[in-house]
């Protein structure tokens, strides 16, 4: 069967997010991907969306991320814009209203996004073959 258009959009957004570092990409996020052994794919996507929402809600106005120049401010705004897009599409793919996020280890945002990209690419290769 054909791949969901949402999945393609997620991969595109993840590519944009992982190509460049910003002041915020070294900050930590709850690493639900490391603790997703006994969860369904939909639950994993739902939890990923949840922790991403927690991240950007917490750091959207974080002065460490906004930086000292208009250039850094612009990059942070772009980062937040992409994270919101990713969050929205992950909810669409998950098809769940809510999901519990247990206490877990922390990962940098950039590592989390790289691993999420790997997961999404694997899913895409399966559905496109």
């Amino acid at each position: 069967h054909k791949c969901d258009i949402t999945l393609q959009e997620i991969i595109k957004t993840l590519n944009s997010l992982t190509e460049q570092k910003t002041l915020c990409t070294k900050l930590t996020i709850t690493d639900i991907l490391a603790a997703s052994k006994n969860t369904t794919e939909k639950e994993t996507f739902c939890r990923a969306a949840t922790v991403l929402r927690q991240f950007y809600s917490h750091h959207e106005k974080d002065t460490r991320c906004l930086g000292a120049t208009a250039q850094q401010f612009h990059r942070h705004k772009q980062l937040i814009r992409f994270l919101k897009r990713l969050d929205r599409n992950l909810w669409g793919l998950a098809g769940l209203n809510s999901c519990p996020v247990k206490e877990a280890n922390q990962s940098t945002l950039e590592n989390f996004l790289e691993r999420l990209k790997t997961i999404m690419r694997e899913k895409y290769s399966k559905c496109s073959s």
């Epitope: 944009s16 190509e19 460049q20 120049t69 250039q71 772009q78």
Partner: antibody, heavy 123, light 106 residues
Framework: QLQLQESGPGLVKPSETLSLTCTVS??????????WGWIRQPPGKGLEWIGS???????DYNPSLKSRVTISVDTSKNQFSLKLSSVTAADTAVYYC???????????????WGQGTMVTVSS | DIQMTQSPSSLSASVGDRVTITCQAS??????LNWYQQKPGKAPKLLIY???NLETGVPSRFSGSGSGTDFTFTISSLQPEDIATYYC????????FGGGTKVEIK
């Protein structure tokens, strides 16, 4: 296709203010994902970034020129402008306007440039 | 301010030769480095962005590599139309251009 066109006087007297305008056609200057810059090149020399302006109106300037530079935007005219005060012969250069940023990336290089306008500072 | 040191300042090579230009940043700039080509009387043209990505429509003989502080720009087989000055530019923290490398045909 987006195009940029610089305009302004080709000759400015020392100690006066150099004023240039860049008109953007084929696209909106108001997009959140893009920003706009000025770069100059003295005759036979290299490129020097002057400053940039973002959709919010916030600006960054080259520290070496900061005290003399003002960049502003007029969204109604789809234009942005450069003012450089107290000019000397060292400000004689080709002045370029350019677009930076991208809708599908966190940031991007200055990828679209105007053809440049020569400004001579002389009495 | 981040300084960009580009070398050589000029070079002469034969058509078909492999040409290499280097650029060194005074501090870590990650992959926020671009390469531009400028022909006499023309505006600079973006060739490579983020150290190694080829801008759309640019011939594949142009390539870039590097990360951190050391970067390389390569023309795999020099063509007559490649005669120009090439500039590196960092945009990790504001913007700084290298001094340029003038490429001529032997």
């Amino acid at each position: 296709q987006l195009q940029l066109q610089e305009s302004g006087p080709g000759l400015v007297k020392p100690s006066e203010t150099l004023s240039l305008t860049c008109t953007v056609s084929g696209g909106s200057i108001s997009s959140e994902s893009y920003y706009w810059g000025w770069i100059r090149q003295p005759p036979g020399k290299g490129l020097e970034w002057i400053g940039s302006i973002y959709y919010s109106g916030s600006t960054d300037y080259n520290p070496s020129l900061k005290s003399r530079v003002t960049i502003s935007v007029d969204t109604s005219k789809n234009q942005f402008s450069l003012k450089l005060s107290s000019v000397t012969a060292a400000d004689t250069a080709v002045y370029y306007c350019a677009r930076g940023g991208a809708s599908d990336r966190i940031d991007h290089a200055f990828d679209i440039w105007g053809q440049g306008t020569m400004v001579t500072v002389s009495s | 301010d981040i300084q960009m040191t580009q070398s050589p300042s000029s070079l002469s090579a034969s058509v078909g030769d492999r040409v290499t230009i280097t650029c060194q940043a005074s501090q870590d700039i990650s992959n926020y480095l671009n390469w531009y080509q400028q022909k006499p009387g023309k505006a600079p043209k973006l060739l490579i962005y983020d150290a190694s990505n080829l801008e759309t429509g640019v011939p594949s003989r142009f390539s870039g590599s590097g990360s951190g502080t050391d970067f390389t720009f390569t023309i795999s087989s020099l063509q007559p139309e490649d005669i120009a000055t090439y500039y590196c530019q960092q945009y990790y923290d504001l913007y700084t251009f290298g001094g340029g490398t003038k490429v001529e045909i032997k």
